[in-house]
Interface confidence: medium
């Protein structure tokens, strides 16, 4: 039988067995997060575990804009640099931008300098767009 | 205080252009982003475009590039709005609004500058 | 993409009223909604801010929320009073567009 394709919530797009909802409003890391859940279905700030589902989200938000950088479900809550995803997913795909991690940066954001492809560190408390993602 | 002074009414025929100014007091003219609105009377707030007070740069709605023009002098803390080849359907209130630097909203609106055309 | 209002509501003083937003395309929660009051002669002034935020000044007889599954977001004023009587718009962007509700006039009994 042919496998269908599940349905998201409405703007959400699908890829993968995921939905994402790209969200352009400013909200802090936390807020972000706290944002995501209330959509229920299991839905956090969105994990991206390789680079077919990084290019699939890049292309997507490069649609809208492409100078905005947007918070991600990755984050260092030890503040020891011990990262992890907040929706559990394994830490194995990673794709840091190779600037310094160092300072009061703790929360990951998918940087705009390279079209969304790679991440940065940033501040928590910096208010910036956001994605999610659940699985449906 | 945080304020918006907008020109005065004008009158113009059509096919003639407009130029409305907004002038900024009680804050830095600077990394803000201000935007031009126009009103039809009996009709909501139509958004026609924006221009960064810092770099100059601009955003023009859809139905407005290639007739509108948005300017800013810094000396002055003035910005312009331009409208070229104006029709009767032009006539309407034009605010100018600022976005606030802190959120997405526009927190400090201009009195309105009344244009009417007509022939 | 649009944000349609009912064209007017009315209410008594002291009462409860709810204005309503919905758009027509994309997921209204994806970009912020503020709402506007403007008075006859008056420039628009913000009422709420990011949904549901209220500027400095705002009595909390106003109130902001959205809903995803009707897609729409809602204006609340409670305790209504007679100088609440304006025109409300809701407000949104697209990434490129900021784009106005159709207006809602409300009349206090």
């Known amino acids: 039988d042919i496998i269908m394709r599940p349905s998201c919530a409405p703007g959400w797009f699908y890829h993968k067995s995921n939905c994402y909802g790209y969200f352009r409003k400013l909200r802090n890391w936390s807020d972000a997060e706290l944002e995501c859940q209330s959509y229920g279905n299991g839905a956090h700030l969105a994990s991206i575990l390789s680079l077919k589902e990084a290019s699939t989200i890049a292309e997507y938000i490069s649609g809208y804009q492409r100078s905005q950088p947007i918070w991600i479900g990755l984050h260092d809550p030890q503040k020891r640099q011990q990262w992890q995803w907040i929706d559990g997913a394994m830490y194995l795909y990673r794709s840091w931008s190779g600037k310094s991690m160092g300072g009061n940066k703790h929360c990951a954001e998918m940087s705009s300098n390279n079209n969304f492809l790679t991440w940065s560190s940033n501040e928590c408390n910096k208010r910036q767009h956001f994605l999610c993602k659940y699985r449906p | 205080q945080v304020q918006l002074v907008q020109s005065g009414a004008e009158v113009k025929k059509p096919g003639a252009s407009v130029k409305v100014s907004c002038k900024a007091a009680g804050f830095r003219f600077s990394g803000d982003y201000l935007h031009w609105l126009r009103q039809v009377p009996g009709q909501g707030p139509e958004w026609m475009g924006w221009i960064n007070l810092s770099s100059g740069g601009t955003n023009y709605g859809e139905k407005f590039q290639g007739r509108v023009t948005m300017t800013r002098d810094r000396p002055s803390s003035t910005a312009y709005m331009e409208i070229k080849s104006l029709r009767v359907d032009d006539t309407a209130v034009y605010y100018c609004?600022?976005?606030?630097?802190?959120?997405?909203?526009?927190?400090?609106w201009g009195r309105g500058t009344l244009v009417t055309v007509s022939s | 993409f649009m944000l349609t209002q009912p064209h007017s509501v009315s209410e008594s003083p002291g009462k409860t009223v709810t204005i309503s937003c919905t758009r027509s395309s994309d997921n209204i929660a994806f970009n912020y909604v503020q709402w506007y009051q403007q008075r006859p002669g008056s420039a628009p002034t913000t009422l709420i801010y990011e949904d549901n935020q209220r500027p400095s000044g705002v009595p909390d007889r106003f109130s902001g929320s959205i809903d995803s599954s009707s897609n729409s977001a809602s204006l609340t004023i409670s305790n209504l009073k007679t100088e609440d009587e304006a025109d409300y718009y809701c407000q949104s962007y697209d990434g490129s567009n900021y784009v106005f509700g159709t207006g809602t006039k409300l009349t206090v009994l």
């Open positions: 609004a600022r976005e606030s630097p802190v959120v997405e909203a526009m927190d400090v």
